[in-house]
Interface confidence: medium
């Protein structure tokens, strides 16, 4: 599923991401835009043999199990395929674990490079939330 901007903002808000660990909803929508272009089925492979999955591009070395990543920790205790569902519950729950890990949203390279320090509220402007 490819979400619309406001559609995703509403879904993320429903799942309790607004101001989760101090990160406003705009941060999460911005991250999803530049990680996956709002596509729940996005997958991207990394040079270390891991793969990033889903709307927030969660990595198989640390957070989920895809059955083939050397030394996978599976800290979210889920199959990576669950992160590709049109229902974003699994991605959101895992993202909450990631953002609580100590580095906050710096864990997402696209957020660091494209969202951090920008007007992230623009990503939810005009949305009925």
């Amino acid at each position: 599923k490819v979400f619309g901007r406001c559609e995703l903002a509403a879904a993320m808000k429903r799942h309790g991401l607004d101001n989760y660990r101090g990160y406003s909803l705009g941060n999460w929508v911005c991250a999803a835009k530049f990680e996956s272009n709002f596509n729940t089925q996005a997958t991207n492979r990394n040079t270390d043999g891991s793969t990033d999955y889903g709307i927030l591009q969660i990595n198989s070395r640390w957070w989920c199990n895809d059955g083939r990543t050397p030394g996978s920790r599976n800290l979210c205790n889920i199959p990576c395929s669950a992160l590709l569902s049109s229902d974003i519950t699994a991605s959101v729950n895992c993202a909450k674990k990631i953002v609580s890990d100590g580095n906050g949203m710096n864990a997402w390279v696209a957020w660091r490079n494209r969202c951090k320090g920008t007007d992230v509220q623009a990503w939810i402007r005009g949305c009925r939330l």
């Epitope: 043999g49 895809d66 059955g67 050397p70 395929s81």
Partner: antibody
């Protein structure tokens, strides 16, 4: 136990297309990548690409882009590989395997012969 | 693409001999190297994963070693059922690649 059952041998004419199937049992089909491998005598084993059945995400070896197309049907736990514009170079044994990084589980192989 | 070069291409041995098969990668692949045995008209069978981890059900006479670019599959006291082709495969990066194989044959 995990099993991958491939479709039977095919004899095709040059220029035709063929669709090979790989039925998986014994594990959660949608969760694991299915990989496809080609074997020709004297050419060893070549990785064609992979599909994640749960999402339909696919990756192809550059060499096989435009030649192979992967699909999967999660209702029947079956992965498919279509090969198009067949030539004699496509005559080979084609294997599906479960993608664990390594390949512990293989299909029995489908022999494709392309001949006029 | 990562190239895997296996040597020798053919190895002629007598049952009871011990042998070593080599697989060399064109760049470092850490320990992401796996070994397979294949008999005629059969699918490959996984022997060793991650350079040295013996797969369940594989006899202990098989062992693997190496890291980086140089890897070895050793068979301690070859038995008649061990004859066939041996392939290495890397999972360090895409595309996955295989070595050209070593044929283990009876002398």
């Amino acid at each position: 136990q995990v099993q991958l059952q491939e479709s039977g041998a095919e004899v095709m004419k040059p220029g035709a297309s063929v669709k090979i199937s790989c039925k998986a049992t014994g594990y959660t089909f949608s969760t694991y990548w299915i990989e496809w491998v080609k074997q020709r005598p004297g050419h060893g084993l070549e990785w064609i690409g992979e599909i994640l059945p749960g999402s339909g995400s696919t990756y192809y070896n550059e060499k096989f882009k435009g030649k192979a197309t992967f699909t999967a049907d999660t209702s029947s736990n079956t992965a498919y590989m279509q090969l198009s514009s067949l030539t004699s170079e496509d005559s080979a044994v084609y294997y599906c395997a479960r993608g664990d990084g390594w390949y512990c589980y293989w299909g029995q192989g489908t022999t494709l012969t392309v001949s006029s | 693409d990562i190239e895997l070069t296996q040597s020798p291409a053919t190895l002629s041995v007598t049952p009871g001999d011990s042998v070593s098969l080599s697989c060399r990668a064109s760049q470092s692949i850490s320990n992401n190297l796996h070994w397979y045995q294949q008999k005629p008209h059969e699918s490959p069978r996984l022997l060793i994963k991650y350079a040295s981890q013996l797969e369940s059900g594989i006899p202990s006479r098989f062992s693997g070693s190496g890291s980086g670019t140089d890897f070895t599959l050793s068979i301690n006291s070859v038995e008649t059922e061990d004859f066939g082709m041996y392939f290495c495969q890397q999972s360090n990066s895409w595309p996955r690649t295989f070595g050209g194989g070593t044929k283990l044959e009876i002398k």
